[in-house]
Interface confidence: medium
């Protein structure tokens, strides 16, 4: 079996983990996925996904989560804005594909939030408000609450991450609903 | 306040080449998307194509499809697009506008740059 | 691709007079349509998002409505400087499109 390696990134609060996580463009493209914390001696549990099936370039927003799946490139990206230090925590990204259990996509990410100034929104001079609000209307990605802590016999490509800080906060409230927004082809 | 600034006007020969750039300055660069969209005097808008940064990989309207070159550089915060084989119905003020979402508003502009196809 | 048509091509009304301008989808674009002003000399500066959000900025005369393929954009007290062109965007799917661009005039 192969070991689950992690990805460190050390970010401040009020900042952006912009991640990436690369999939089998063939075999996965339209395929439904998520984002997962794994919390000790739990079973991961998938915070957001994309829509079933996933659709091209149009994100899913949970919260302070997005989540763009661009079949062109083979990739699911997973922003998480305005980082809280309760975000520290593993994370996973994986593809469903029932009735067979979820796929893992390497490397875990091991997500560290500190406190400090550093592109808190509202509290430097460059932060200005975002044009962008949640839609008032939503449609809604169901998506299992759990998955399996299932041993993964072949590592995919690994995720790459970006770290940023957002010039302008993104209006974000504490949503549980899982809502579709308009992202590239 | 973000803004987005481009270099300035040009004037080209038919079947030349020309790059345009969009500078971001006062923010966060990488995780948004810029597009180009051009308008031909006294004509609309029409999207080009684009590119999120981060990803490096663009995307673009078939009908410029091997014809332009968006490409963006994290390290200046710079966006570039390139057209080649130009001809005089190219000539357009061509804008670079920012996205939080790939498939999105564009909810920042640049000034425009006047590009000019004369013989 | 998603062809946008504005009506009317142009709209001549008067300071304080409602102006409403139509924009239709040659297909479902869901509510992922924007409106850009654009004015002489100048980049197009974003009004409405997502069919009905404004804008930050965007003052509240300036309203938009529809889903699907039909949308409307409404200016409920025409202002000097709103006398502009207008146009719609879909970002529902690729490529991006615009419409043809209403342009509002002083009657």
């Known amino acids: 079996a192969t070991k689950l390696t992690e990805e460190k990134y050390e970010l401040k609060e009020g900042q952006t983990l912009d991640v990436k996580c690369d999939y089998t463009l063939e075999k996965f493209a339209s395929s439904q996925k998520a984002w997962q914390i794994i919390r000790d001696g739990e079973m991961p549990k998938t915070l957001a996904c994309t829509e079933r099936p996933s659709k091209n370039s149009h994100p899913v927003q949970v919260g302070r989560i997005i989540l763009e799946d661009y079949h062109d490139h083979g990739l699911l990206r997973v922003r998480m804005v305005n980082l809280q230090v309760e975000d520290s925590g593993l994370y996973q990204c994986v593809i469903y594909q029932p009735p067979k259990e979820p796929h893992m996509l390497f490397d875990r990410i091991r997500l560290v939030v500190t406190k400090g100034f550093s592109g808190t929104p509202g509290s430097n001079e460059n932060s200005t408000q975002n044009v962008y609000k949640i839609p008032p209307t939503t449609t809604k990605a169901l998506c299992p609450l759990y998955t399996s802590p299932r041993t993964v016999t072949q590592a995919p490509p690994k995720s790459t991450a970006d770290v940023s800080t957002p010039d302008s906060e993104i209006n974000l409230t504490n949503v549980t609903d899982i809502i579709r927004v308009p992202v590239f082809n | 306040q973000v803004q987005l600034v481009q270099s300035g006007a040009e004037v080209k020969k038919p079947g030349s080449s020309v790059k345009v750039s969009c500078k971001a300055s006062?923010?966060?660069?990488?995780?948004?998307?810029i597009s180009w969209v051009r308008q031909a005097p006294g004509q609309g808008l029409e999207w080009m194509g684009g590119?999120?940064?981060?990803?490096?990989?663009?995307n673009y309207a078939q009908k410029f499809q091997g014809r332009v070159t968006i490409t963006a550089d994290e390290s200046t915060s710079t966006a570039y697009m390139e057209l080649s084989s130009l001809r005089s119905e190219d000539t357009a003020v061509y804008y670079c506008a920012r996205h939080w979402y790939a498939l999105g508003s564009f909810d920042i502009w640049g000034q425009g740059t006047m590009v000019t196809v004369s013989s | 691709e998603i062809v946008m048509t504005q009506s009317p091509a142009t709209l001549s009304l008067s300071p304080g007079e409602r102006a409403t301008l139509s924009c239709r989808a040659s297909q479902s674009v869901s509510s992922y349509l924007a409106w850009y002003q654009q004015k002489p000399g100048q980049a197009p500066r974003l009004l409405i998002y997502d069919s009905s959000n404004r804008a930050t900025g965007i003052p509240a005369r300036f309203s938009g409505s529809g889903s699907g393929t039909d949308f409307t954009l409404t200016i409920s007290s025409l202002e000097p400087e709103d006398f502009a062109v207008y146009y719609c965007?879909?970002?529902?799917?690729?490529?991006?499109?615009f419409g043809g661009g209403t342009k509002v005039e002083i009657k």
């Open positions: 006062g923010g966060t660069f990488s995780s948004y998307a």
């Open positions: 965007q879909q970002h529902d799917v690729w490529p991006i499109t």
């Open positions: 590119i999120i940064p981060i990803f490096g990989t663009a």
